[in-house]
């Protein structure tokens, strides 16, 4: 059963990057408002974003409580504003979201190369360990803290003077690669979770090249 003057939400979509998680839906409301509820498969429905005219709801605070749980959300529609109404007609209309498991589905954010250091024919490239909104003991965990060895980084590197790319992989946040003496190199990294079936890879980081600010060079 539903309420006159309202339409159900549709196109419920999870938008999640590094566990920052927003539920989006349509349509833009006309004389109606929305309330969102979120639940784990075994849990209770918790109301969030009460009576909002937005078509999105930030559910990060809820999903970071246990990123390995599977969540379901639903969006309720209520008549509102200066509409003819003589009391509530049963339960409001609602629509369910797809299931969402943050650990398996959150998009990996674009990584950043924190620094690179050349020592002779070796270059150490360090990837910034992005902070997430997942907490443990009142401190925010990094992406590495959350994913551990499930997360790897792929480094793409090439001589500034050529286009032939080489790759390296690490399950830490550091690479140590061999380079030709006297050559400048460019670097880009990508975060990867090989065990995933969806959203396995991030976009590539911005390119950083030797001879620019980020690096430190020590010829030995």
């Amino acid at each position: 059963s539903g309420t006159t003057n309202t339409v159900a939400a549709y196109n419920l979509t999870w938008k999640s990057t590094n566990f920052k998680t927003i539920l989006e839906w349509e349509p833009k409301p006309v004389n109606q408002v929305y309330t969102v509820q979120i639940s784990t498969k075994s849990g209770d429905w918790k109301s969030k974003c009460f009576y909002t005219t937005d078509t999105e709801c930030d559910l990060t605070d809820e999903i970071v409580k246990d990123v390995k749980q599977t969540y379901l959300a639903r969006v309720f529609s209520y008549p509102a504003g200066n509409v003819e109404s003589t009391g509530s007609a049963g339960e409001p209309l609602y629509e369910n979201s797809p299931e969402f498991t943050p650990y398996l589905e959150t998009n990996l954010g674009q990584p950043t190369i924190q620094s690179f250091e050349q020592v002779g024919t070796k270059v150490n490239v360090t990837v910034e360990d992005e902070r997430t909104l997942v907490r443990r003991n009142n401190t925010f965990l990094s992406l590495r803290d959350v994913f551990g060895k499930d997360l790897i980084y792929t480094l793409y590197y090439w001589k500034s003077s050529s286009s032939g790319k080489k790759t390296a992989k690490t399950n830490t946040n550091e690479f140590l690669i061999d380079v030709d003496k006297g050559e400048n190199y460019c670097f880009s990294v990508q975060a990867v979770i090989p065990s995933r079936t969806v959203n396995r890879k991030s976009t590539d980081s911005p390119v950083e090249c030797m001879g620019q600010e980020k690096g430190e060079f020590r010829e030995i």
């Epitope: 408002v33 849990g43 209770d44 429905w45 918790k46 109301s47 009460f50 009576y51 005219t53 409580k65 209520y78 008549p79 509102a80 504003g81 200066n82 509409v83 003819e84 109404s85 509530s88 339960e91 409001p92």
Partner: antibody
């Protein structure tokens, strides 16, 4: 049907604490936000804070921060509001109230009168 | 915090008369809620989301408004309507209530 039954009237000394209970029935206690609102004699209403019994998530009005603690016991379907460092201005009727259709203050307890007097 | 100012504080009217209660917000809010309270009783939800009558509220009641100005209207007062009415907002934290309008029998 939804019922919220509150504990009886209390008389307290300034500086002491009071703990008011609100026993819920007729619904799944852990699935709904519970709010506390008070009304001083002859005055308007004031939101104190809220709790989601499912996970203990709570929020408080800054005016009461540090003096109020709202808890919930899922095993007995009871919410509690404890107010400390009482002063005469805290004399009021305290209500628990639950979210419902189209309204966050949809169902109300009968109220508990707390009198703070020396 | 949002301050809600209700006017008048007291209305003395006879049964059958029309009553319009006003609620003015210190900043624009999305929706207004109204509660009816009788002596020695808890408030009861009366109008929600500006214009929706709560369950069991007679059709002689209506609510409207937007932004900072909202109103509750009783088209023809009946004996059971004499009570105090409070407006309330939760567009911004903390939720706040107006000081109330008492509708008494003239």
């Amino acid at each position: 049907q939804v019922q919220l039954v509150q504990s009886g009237a209390e008389v307290k000394r300034p500086g002491s604490s009071v703990k008011v209970s609100c026993k819920a029935s007729g619904y799944t206690f852990s699935s709904y936000w519970m709010y506390w609102v008070r009304q001083a004699p002859g005055q308007g209403l004031e939101w104190i804070g809220q709790i989601y019994p499912g996970d203990g998530d709570s929020n408080y009005n800054e005016n009461f921060q540090g003096r109020v603690t709202i808890t919930a016991d899922k095993s007995t379907s009871t919410a509690y509001m404890e107010l400390s460092s009482l002063r005469s201005e805290d004399t009021a009727v305290y209500y628990c109230t639950r979210e419902g259709y189209g309204n966050r203050f949809a169902y109300w307890g009968q109220g508990t009168l707390v009198t703070v007097s020396s | 915090e949002i301050v809600l100012t209700q006017s008048p504080a007291l209305m003395s009217l006879s049964p059958g008369e029309r009553a319009t209660l006003s609620c003015s917000a210190s900043s624009s809010v999305s929706y207004m809620y109204w509660y009816q309270q009788k002596p020695r009783s808890a408030p009861r939800p009366w109008i929600q989301l500006t214009s929706n009558l709560a369950s069991g509220v007679p059709a002689r009641f209506s609510g409207r408004g937007s932004g900072t100005d909202f109103s509750l209207t009783i088209s023809s007062l009946e004996a059971e309507d004499f009570a105090t009415y409070y407006c309330q907002q939760w567009s911004y934290n903390p939720p706040t209530f107006g000081g109330g309008t008492k509708v008494e029998i003239k």
